[in-house]
């Protein structure tokens, strides 16, 4: 109604002796600004005087004067909207009605607010969700209808008297609608929390106890089970009896059904807390557990592994692999079902016991032909010895052995002759099925293993044959020694070993691949000028002026042959390569080792390749190879290869030794 002043504030405020009250308040006057404000305690209207009687807690007039005793009560408002009040400290006798007497220029109003001050701090109130289930997160709420800026408080959660680890979220409200302090705790209860006491404790700023509220947790959970077995180790022999008992240590609500499972599958007609297995067989070995259900769901016990022991069954032998190739490794496996596992094995080769072989597996690292035959075994455990099974056959295959190439016609052979050769061998498994000849040619094979060469050429220098089954075995080549004029005459630099550079002593060799007859003469020339008649051309100290085009000639009684022109260049591929090691060739593990590839090359080396003692290339291409941290396993010989536009050069092996650190030695 338009003739009323409009106020907003909490209807009732709660506090206790010695605390404080903060009263959030807003108002709207009918006209103009507030000119006078009086705060009464339990005001009563006096009809005779047309005024309110009662204790005046606070008084403010136009001149703004406030009596000094009013410091406990503060008006924090203003002349047109805010009427917020504070009483600090608040006393028991402040309980009752507060009256806000407001006067503007022409209007008056009395607004009443209830104040409830208790002798001692009143308890907070814990709110729980309607149902709590194990491992499902719930929010616990603790609510206190109190908050005041001048009196800080805290709400602490305890479980069975011990502060809870989970972080609580505390919120406060000091508004015209509500005044409260609330603490919310997110919590995932376990079944073991069932029946436990949760406390919300109200404390002052120093942590001193003021009041509390408690509740008992009702945590719904699946049945918690313990399984017991007789005998306790669950190891029996065939024909023995076994008893398993299922005990419920906790269930909320009460359990309804019980069942037993073996290897995850439910056992029929087993719905009691005791499982009796009479005269067990080996098939009853497995993992057993009991399952008990309630309205929340099923609970399972831990698994009991029942082992039914029996003597080994007849054994079989598995060979990896047959047929086996000579030189390969073969493994024999004795397979026999038994519990406990066999502790001893006896192996037989062709019916004869193999001495010193008592393991489940027999490993032959390098198979030889005499290893072929029948292998069988017998398994043994504490309950007895099994029977020997049928055994398994090992077939050892190998390439043809001692292959030779034999020349059938008389020596010497001259260019144009007809030559007959045969290919012979000693033994073979499987049998020889074909022969191969090197080099290939358009030659006749009149019968298996025989080769006929019509009109033999100068270049038929050597012939080799191979006898083949699944593999080919090559004989050493035989020389035909066909007589012909010198062939493949070429200039070869024999000194220095690496590329030439100025000042070196240089020797050029006039080479030819072969000559029959062997008696020959040599001639050297450069730019048409005769230089010498020896097989070598020597320079004591080479100079750039010696560069040029060189040729040599070789004569025998059949004819003469000239080399191609050979260009002498004073350029060289990397040489004098060596691997140096820093800090030295002996380094302690965990430290750093730097290997440097040092070389002499023109043009300079463009990149390097590094190798280990097995000639395996390492993924580095620069001059330095850094191993950090270096390990004992890195010990070994390393070498490097340098490459430039002319060619490659390689170093000799350089050995790095990595020794154990004192720490490692101390641990051993």
């Amino acid at each position: 109604d338009s003739s009323k002043w409009v106020f907003e504030h909490p209807e009732t405020l709660y506090a206790w002796e010695g605390a404080c009250v903060w009263i959030p308040c807003t108002y709207r006057a009918l006209d103009g600004d507030l000119e006078s404000f009086i705060l009464f305690h339990n005001p009563e209207y006096n009809k005779n005087t047309s005024k309110f009687d009662g204790t005046r807690l606070y008084e403010s007039t136009k001149d703004g004067k406030v009596p000094s005793e009013q410091k406990r009560v503060q008006f924090l408002g203003d002349k047109n909207k805010n009427c917020t009040l504070s009483i600090h400290p608040v006393h028991l006798n402040d309980s009752g009605q507060l009256g806000l007497r407001m006067e503007s220029k022409t209007e008056k109003w009395m607004e009443r607010i209830h104040l409830n001050v208790s002798e001692r701090p009143f308890p907070p109130h814990i709110q729980l969700p309607p149902e709590i289930q194990e491992s499902q997160e719930v929010t616990l709420t603790c609510l206190l209808n109190f908050s005041c800026y001048g009196y800080p408080i805290q709400l602490q959660w305890l479980l069975e008297g011990v502060p809870m680890r989970q972080a609580a979220v505390t919120s406060t409200s000091l508004t015209i609608k509500s005044v409260f302090t609330r603490s919310e705790l997110k919590f995932s209860p376990q079944w073991s929390h069932h029946g436990k006491i949760v406390t919300c404790q109200l404390q002052d700023a120093d942590g001193k106890f003021l009041s509390n509220d408690t509740v008992q947790l009702n945590v719904k959970h699946t049945p918690k089970l313990e399984i017991k077995v007789t005998p306790s180790d669950a190891i029996v022999r065939e024909g023995d009896s076994v008893t398993m008992t299922c005990e419920v240590s906790s269930s909320n609500p009460e359990y309804t059904t019980v069942s037993w499972l073996k290897d995850g599958t439910s056992l029929k007609k087993q719905n009691t807390f005791t499982l009796n297995l009479r005269e067990v067989t080996k098939d009853q070995s497995g993992k057993y557990c009991c399952q008990v259900s309630n309205d929340v769901g099923p609970g399972r016990s831990e698994e009991v592994f029942l082992q039914v022991q029996y003597a080994p069954e007849p054994s079989t032998v598995q060979i990896l692999h047959s047929p086996a190739v000579e030189g390969s490794q073969v493994e024999f496996l004795c397979m026999s079902l038994a519990n406990p596992l066999p502790t001893n094995y006896t192996w037989y080769h062709n019916g004869k016991e193999m001495q010193g072989r008592t393991e489940e597996k027999v490993h032959i690292p390098k198979i030889l032909p005499w290893h072929a035959g029948t292998y069988s075994c017998v398994a043994e455990n504490i309950l007895g010895t099994g029977q020997r099974g049928p055994g398994a056959e090992l077939d050892v295959q190998y390439p043809p052995k001692k292959v030779t190439t034999v020349i059938q016609n008389p020596m010497p052979i001259r260019e144009g002759d007809t030559v007959t050769l045969s290919c012979n061998y000693n033994s073979s498994n499987p049998s020889v099925t074909r022969y191969e000849w090197k080099p290939h040619g358009a030659w006749e094979e009149p019968s298996l293993g025989v080769l006929k060469i019509q009109n033999v050429g100068w270049d038929n220098t050597t012939i080799a044959c191979a006898a083949c089954n699944s593999w080919c075995s090559w004989a050493s080549p035989v020389a035909l020694n066909v007589q012909y004029a010198p062939r493949d005459v070429r200039v070869r630099k024999i000194k220095p070993l690496s590329e030439i550079h100025s000042g070196n002593s240089v020797s050029l060799q006039c080479d030819f691949s072969s000559s029959h007859p062997k008696e020959v003469q040599f001639f050297w020339e450069k730019n048409g000028r005769l230089l010498g008649k020896e097989s070598q051309l020597n320079f004591d100290s080479i100079s750039p002026e010696d560069a040029g085009s060189y040729s040599c000639w070789v004569n025998n009684s059949i004819g003469q042959t000239a080399s191609k022109a050979w260009t002498l260049e004073v350029l060289y591929a990397p040489r004098r390569l060596r691997v140096s090691m820093s800090p030295g060739d002996q380094v302690m593990e965990g430290k750093s080792a730097t290997l440097t590839c040092e070389s002499d090359a023109n043009p300079p080396v463009s990149h390097y390749t590094w190798f280990d003692w097995n000639n395996q290339s390492l993924p580095y291409h620069s001059q330095k190879l850094r191993l950090e941290p270096v390990k004992v396993q890195h010990s070994g010989a390393y070498w490097c290869q340098g490459t430039n536009s002319v060619g490659k050069g390689r170093s000799p092996l350089s050995t790095l030794t990595v020794y154990y650190s004192p720490e490692t030695i101390g641990r051993r």
Partner: antibody
């Protein structure tokens, strides 16, 4: 064909250890013609090689100087995989982490893992 | 450490254009230079190894050249799927290092 499959957490707290695994299919971690690398990528650092493990006649490791004191790369021959451990991480270690194969024939990273975004926070 | 400097850092081009990206090493790395392509949210993909060898399955419009310290990647005729970031990488010595990348954008 060769594939690399990465696994490991995407969030690591500062000062803790970052652990990632790279499972290899179609090749062997013990190959004597390959090296197995870890590389990371962040807006501030770009692509950054962290280190590698490889087998020739024995196992070798190379590490970048920037992480040398904190990094371990280990092969696991039984599972045909290799792993990265980076200790004492800071927010500067936040990046996408890749594993990659480097083959002798090309000396290049020819096969890469799918990448794992790791945030240090 | 060997520093790898790529230029330009970004490049705008149109489909059908011929594009060249350069990479410079702070010291000679012979021909141990590789090129990669990376698209957002994906791992880098090998395009060129050993400076000029085309990785199997990579279109022939990509080519690489150079040795020593200066290298180039050329795309002869840009296709829509080629817009990505390109990186060079040296495998000459450890630590293995990458260039800062060149972002190729549609003009």
């Amino acid at each position: 064909q060769v594939q690399l499959q990465q696994s490991g957490p995407g969030l690591v707290k500062p000062s803790q250890t970052l652990s990632l695994t790279c499972a290899i299919s179609g090749d062997s971690v013990s190959s004597n013609s390959a090296a197995w690398n870890w590389i990371r990528q962040s807006p501030s650092r770009g692509l950054e090689w962290l280190g590698r493990t490889y087998y020739r006649s024995t196992w070798y490791n190379d590490y970048a100087v920037s992480v040398k004191s904190r990094i371990t790369i280990n092969p696991d021959t039984s599972k045909n995989q290799f792993s990265l451990q980076l200790n004492s991480v800071t927010p500067e270690d936040t990046a996408v982490y890749y594993c990659a194969r480097e083959v002798s024939g090309t000396s290049a990273f020819d096969i890469w893992g799918q990448g794992t975004m790791v945030t240090v926070s | 450490d060997i520093q790898m400097t790529q230029s330009p850092s970004s490049l705008s081009a149109s489909v059908g254009d011929r594009v060249t990206i350069t990479c410079r090493a702070s010291q000679s790395i012979s021909s141990y230079l590789n090129w990669y392509q990376q698209k957002p949210g994906k791992a880098p993909k090998l395009l060129i190894y050993a400076a000029s060898s085309l990785q199997s399955g990579v279109p022939s419009r990509f080519s690489g050249s150079g040795s020593g310290t200066d290298f180039t990647l050329t795309i002869s005729s840009l296709q829509p799927e080629d817009f990505a970031t390109y990186y060079c990488q040296q495998s000459y010595s450890t630590p293995l290092t990458f260039g800062g990348g060149t972002k190729l954008e549609i003009k």
